[in-house]
């Protein structure tokens, strides 16, 4: 077993056989309470300043014959660096100045090993080196500068902030880390609780409007504040926060503003401002119109940035009807503190006089827009309709009319400058353009700068001036073995016109082809027609192609019709009626072309 002579110990170890015994600075009297006393604990004073290495203690194995056959090995916290061992004698020394605040406890392991074999002569033993504290650290505040706020006019003893200083020294030993707080600067306004560091108000009626900022210096001293203790300080910047202890006040009793009668609703006319010594929401002001002839005609809104009241137009003004308005405007704090209501009402009022100024206004059309109609077959100079505009001013200046040529580049329309009659100056075509959107200008003759514009929407009405025609080019075929009355093609027609009652087309063979034709036209009465075979069988060697002239008519007034040609080729087909050959023989019989007669 590893051991040391009892005489070497600072105080006796328990009489218990250990594998490895240690002796040295085990100062057990420092923590003598029996149950927590540890046999394998050393104490070392921190910040040792001696010239030699600080002696820690000695390891000894009872298998050590003193012949150098054993080697003592140290491992764990700081082994070989902070703590070195004489491998022959087992003496342990500390090589550096130790700082308890950096590391208070070192756990090391010791072993005695046979030098020859490397074989441990007993199990590894663990021991502790505790660093003994000295008062070498001053209290340090958690912040160099604290910032805090407290409402103005607070009662004496109101909590402001708690400052905290920590002392790195050992709180479990002596008073090295026992901190006491005191106030060095900031009386008589504030006080500090010596044990907690809580700062409180100490003076009644501290008024922010009088003084807002206070700088308080707090000292923290260890050793319970006794002489010789180390100390640290911190600065606490305290700001008094605002409470609503001041009402709004208008700097003048009357305000006068002017506004043109043309001001649209929402136009700002002027600004009024009541002052309030408070800040933030306590200085917020709500403005309202409480009385006066202008109650319905004007509004007041609050500018949240500047806390000004902005007088705005609520309804359209008319100089010709009323020239002056008087309002009573009130400014009040929306956030009132009941405990300060005894100071009086938190509102004030002022009179606002508004003068309406006359404005020369442009002509006003009788309508916001005009919708007119005209037939597409109207002759040039046909009147479509008229527009009317008047000068709204008392002067009732005469008006002249014109067409804005940017909206009628082709000069299709004209206007009588005196009476506002609109007439055509070119022929119209509904199928080219259905709606014409133009702008008419009304200008005061005596003041050409005053003009107004109005849109005219002119609809062109349909006239039946287009004949129906085939919807597509028709080229069809008929099988040589076709039976009579077999449908070989359906015809469809289109018409550019847009009759009121819709299209109704009729289909027929042209008179010159009707008699003795090899095909017939069947009008389906639904704007389609079918081409049917008229005989059994066709011979493509006799006639390879038939041309059928078809007349298509509408039923509008005046009736319009056109003739379209359908090409029918005679083809050889299989028994399913699928076309096999149409064109090869046509080259042999170049004369095989007929109109179908």
């Amino acid at each position: 077993t590893l051991s040391t002579p009892l005489s070497k110990r600072t105080s006796g170890f328990p009489a218990k056989k250990r594998a490895l015994e240690l002796s040295g600075n085990s100062k057990n009297e420092l923590s003598r309470s029996k149950r927590s006393w540890m046999w394998n604990q050393f104490f070392l004073l921190e910040e040792y300043t001696g010239s030699d290495y600080q002696y820690v203690g000695k390891l000894h194995s009872d298998q050590d014959r003193g012949d150098g056959s054993l080697k003592y090995i140290l491992s764990g916290d700081g082994a070989g660096d902070l703590f070195i061992i004489n491998e022959n004698t087992g003496d342990i020394q500390a090589t550096k100045r130790l700082d308890r605040e950096e590391k208070p406890v070192y756990i090391l392991r010791a072993q005695a090993i046979n030098r020859r074999t490397g074989r441990p002569v007993e199990p590894e033993s663990e021991f502790i080196i505790k660093i003994h504290d000295i008062n070498d650290n001053e209290p340090i505040f958690t912040k160099e500068v604290y910032t805090a706020t407290v409402p103005e006019m607070s009662d004496v003893g109101t909590f402001v902030v708690q400052v905290t200083a920590t002392d790195a020294d050992d709180p479990t030993y002596g008073n090295s880390a026992k901190v006491v707080y005191s106030i060095l600067q900031g009386q008589p306004y504030f006080s500090v609780e010596s044990e907690t560091g809580i700062i409180k108000t100490a003076l009644l009626n501290m008024d922010r409007e009088n003084r807002e900022q206070y700088q308080v210096v707090i000292q923290a001293k260890d050793m319970g504040g006794q002489m010789g203790g180390l100390s640290g300080t911190t600065t606490v910047n305290i700001t008094l926060t605002d409470v609503n202890d001041n009402p709004p006040r208008f700097p003048q009793s009357t305000y006068q503003f002017k506004t043109p009668e043309s001001s649209p609703p929402g136009t700002p006319i002027g600004r009024i401002k009541a002052s309030d010594a408070d800040v933030g929401e306590n200085a917020e002001i709500e403005y309202s119109i409480t009385d006066g002839e202008g109650l319905d005609m004007f509004d007041v809104i609050t500018d949240q940035e500047t806390q000004e009241g902005i007088i705005t137009v609520k309804k359209l003004l008319d100089f010709e009807k009323k020239k002056v308005y008087t309002l009573k405007v009130e400014a009040s704090n929306p956030h009132v503190e009941p405990r300060f209501l005894y100071l009086g009402p938190f509102k004030d009022s002022a009179t606002v006089r508004i003068v309406v100024e006359d404005v020369d206004e442009p002509p006003v059309f009788s309508k916001l827009a005009y919708i007119l109609q005209i037939r597409e077959d109207a002759q040039i100079n046909t009147t479509i309709g008229s527009v009317t505009a008047q000068d709204p001013d008392a002067a009732r200046n005469p008006v002249k009319y014109s067409v804005d040529r940017h909206t009628d580049m082709d000069r299709i329309f004209n206007i009588d400058s005196g009476n506002g009659s609109i007439f055509t100056s070119k022929l119209l075509d509904r199928e080219t353009l259905l709606w014409h959107n133009i702008t008419v200008i009304a200008t005061e003759i005596n003041n050409p700068k005053q003009s107004s514009r109005v849109p005219l929407y002119i609809k062109v009405l349909d006239v039946n001036d287009n004949a129906p025609e085939f919807a597509e080019f028709y080229e069809t075929f008929v099988c040589e073995k076709a039976k009579a009355d077999q449908l070989i093609q359906t015809l469809r027609a289109v018409d550019k016109d847009d009759p009121y009652s819709g299209h109704q087309f009729s289909f027929s063979l042209a008179p010159e082809a009707a008699s003795g034709s090899n095909f017939t036209i069947q009008d389906n009465k639904d704007n389609t027609a079918g081409i049917l075979t008229r005989k059994n069988g066709y011979n493509r060697h006799e006639m390879s192609t038939y041309l059928l002239p078809v007349v298509i008519s509408d039923n509008d007034y005046p009736v319009q019709s056109s003739t379209g040609t359908v090409t029918v080729r005679v083809c050889a087909c299989d028994h399913h009626g699928n076309m096999q050959s149409c064109h090869a023989e046509a080259l042999i019989h170049p004369t095989g072309l007929s109109t179908g007669a």
Epitope: G68, I113, N114, R115, G118, R119, P123
Partner: antibody, heavy 117, light 111 residues
């Protein structure tokens, strides 16, 4: 730096003796045990024994108790191994090696012993 | 005597791969948490060189690709990644009890 110097080769007659040397330098000779190891191509490495230079305490493998004798000369920091009654079975490479906690951390280059008539 | 059995007797490993050698003792060579097994490398015509001591400790100046592990009777030696210069014979050795003994050796060849 630590060095263990051994003669490169020895040629001896059967039945005679030989004393192999190992000169140590670069460390405190008396602080470390000196070991001797035999190596034959077929048999691999074979530990012969060791000696503590400070007290001349020795340990031998049973097989070499009557064959090898380990000695030291502290003044010249030299370890010796005498092999007696040599036969062809003793022909091998013999290494000296410094021992530290059961391991051989430095080795000599080895002496090749040839026993031949 | 404690007999050390090394396996395999020889092995061939590709460059960059792992080489693993086993050493089994006829009885435990561990005491109080210390494992008295050591590993050596021997190249042709040279003395052995200590690589690993006390089962897992790397000797000063030895590359970290060499490693060892194990306790009681079973020990393992690894090289990863294997390099060209690692071609050699590797021995285990115990110092737990006299006489100290060596394993029969493992010859490593690089493919």
């Amino acid at each position: 730096q630590v060095q263990l110097q051994q003669p490169g080769a020895e040629l001896v007659r059967p039945g005679s003796s030989v004393k192999l040397s190992c000169k140590a330098s670069g460390y405190t000779f008396t602080n470390y045990w000196m070991h001797w190891v035999k190596q034959r191509p077929i048999e691999g490495l074979e530990w012969i024994g060791d000696i503590d230079p400070s007290h001349s305490e020795t340990h031998y493998t049973q097989k070499f108790k009557d064959k090898a004798t380990l000695t030291v000369d502290k003044s010249s920091s030299t370890a010796y191994m005498q092999l007696s009654s040599l036969t062809s079975e003793d022909s091998a490479v013999y290494y000296c090696a410094r021992g530290d906690l059961g391991r051989f951390d430095y080795w000599g280059q080895g002496t090749t012993l040839t026993v031949s008539s | 005597d404690i007999v050390l059995t090394q396996s395999p007797a020889s092995l061939a490993v590709s460059l960059g791969q792992r080489a693993t050698i086993s050493c089994r003792a006829s009885e435990s060579v561990s005491i109080h948490g210390t494992h008295l097994m050591h590993w050596y490398q021997q190249k042709s015509g040279q003395p052995p060189k200590l690589l690993i001591y006390a089962a897992s400790n790397l000797e000063s100046g030895v590359p970290a690709r060499f490693s060892g592990s194990g306790s009681e009777t079973d020990f393992t030696f690894n090289i990863h990644p294997v390099e060209e210069e690692d071609a050699a014979t590797y021995f285990c050795q115990q110092s737990f009890e006299d006489p100290w003994t060596f394993g029969g050796g493992t010859k490593l060849e690089i493919k």
